[in-house]
Interface confidence: medium
């Protein structure tokens, strides 16, 4: 099966790398804007310059391209915790990041959240928190683990997943109390 | 002190629509992302949607885009979340919650709203 092919990676294909087909006329091959520029005009003829612009602030683009516009640089998104770790040029896109002690939680490919790293209190760090994932906390006996955090075993409802966790710690007190009295 | 007060849940049919709300109070509502978060019956938590602090940014997981709007009036100190086309799945307690690098108040939020959808 040949995969089908939108008609700019067509015409594209017709011409050598670097170069593209100029929409009005395909036996001409334009040559491509280099990053940071865009196209303002196709190359009027074969061996002809393209007239590529330069992209004005707040926009880039970040490879080769025929690109009638440059792309709108991404602005960090506050209300998700991000903060700007590079600032947009003309060649290359905001880059946003989190503060340190924190990890980017992915809802979606392109949308991420930072949120404090885990302290494992009433715990120990079983694996540091990573760019990408929270710490991994081990509870100390008396806890369970609750969204990542140690809650005590005195916060445990029969309902919840914990009595499975927590129970053996209440038996075993019982335990010690009734061989005291025995 | 920080409470977090959600009211509007109910038994729905599938199909049907409701509107969740949540008073806020102890905080400068108008200062935090809020957002939605529910647990299903068995199941951890699940964040579900959440709403910038001039609410000109909305955020839907993607099982709830194009049925629920997140809303929010900082003049009253209140946070909506309008449920369309209900769904069976949607069955949980709906929390309300602040983002200030985690979701707060987090173990210690209130009682939730509980949303059955069921024939």
């Known amino acids: 099966l040949v995969p089908h092919l939108g008609d700019r990676e067509k015409r594209d294909s017709v011409c050598p790398q670097g170069k593209y087909i100029h929409p009005q006329n395909n036996s001409i091959c334009c040559t491509k804007c280099h990053k940071g520029t865009y196209l303002y005009n196709d190359c009027p003829g074969p061996g002809q310059d393209t007239d590529c612009r330069e992209c004005e602030s707040g926009s880039f683009t970040a490879s080769e391209n025929h690109l009638r516009h440059c792309l709108s640089c991404s602005k960090c998104r506050k209300e998700m915790g991000q903060v700007e770790i590079s600032s947009c040029t003309v060649d290359r896109d905001t880059v946003c990041g989190c503060r340190k002690n924190q990890y980017r939680h992915y809802w979606s490919e392109n949308l991420f959240q930072c949120f404090n790293c885990s302290l494992c209190l009433n715990g120990t760090v079983h694996l540091s928190c990573q760019e990408k994932q929270n710490t991994v906390c081990t509870c100390h006996a008396g806890f369970f683990l609750r969204e990542n955090e140690c809650v005590s075993c005195s916060n445990c409802k029969k309902s919840l997943e914990c009595t499975k966790l927590c129970l053996p710690q209440i038996e075993n007190v019982k335990g010690t109390e009734d061989s005291g009295t025995t | 002190e920080v409470q977090l007060l959600e009211s509007g849940g109910g038994l729905v049919q599938p199909g049907g629509s409701l509107r969740l709300s949540c008073a806020a109070s102890?905080?400068?509502?108008?200062?935090?992302?809020m957002g939605w978060v529910r647990q299903a019956p068995g199941k951890g938590l699940e964040w579900v949607s959440q709403?910038?602090?001039?609410?000109?940014?909305?955020y839907y997981t993607h099982s709830v885009k194009g049925r629920f709007t997140i809303s929010r009036d900082n003049s009253k100190n209140t946070l909506y979340l309008q449920m369309n086309s209900l769904r069976a799945e949607d069955t949980a307690v709906y929390y309300c919650?602040?983002?200030?690098?985690?979701?707060?108040?987090?173990?210690?939020w209130g009682q939730g709203t509980l949303v059955t959808v069921s024939s």
């Open positions: 709403i910038s602090d001039t609410a000109d940014r909305t």
């Open positions: 919650a602040i983002y200030t690098g985690r979701w707060v108040p987090f173990e210690y």
């Open positions: 102890g905080f400068t509502f108008l200062k935090y992302s």
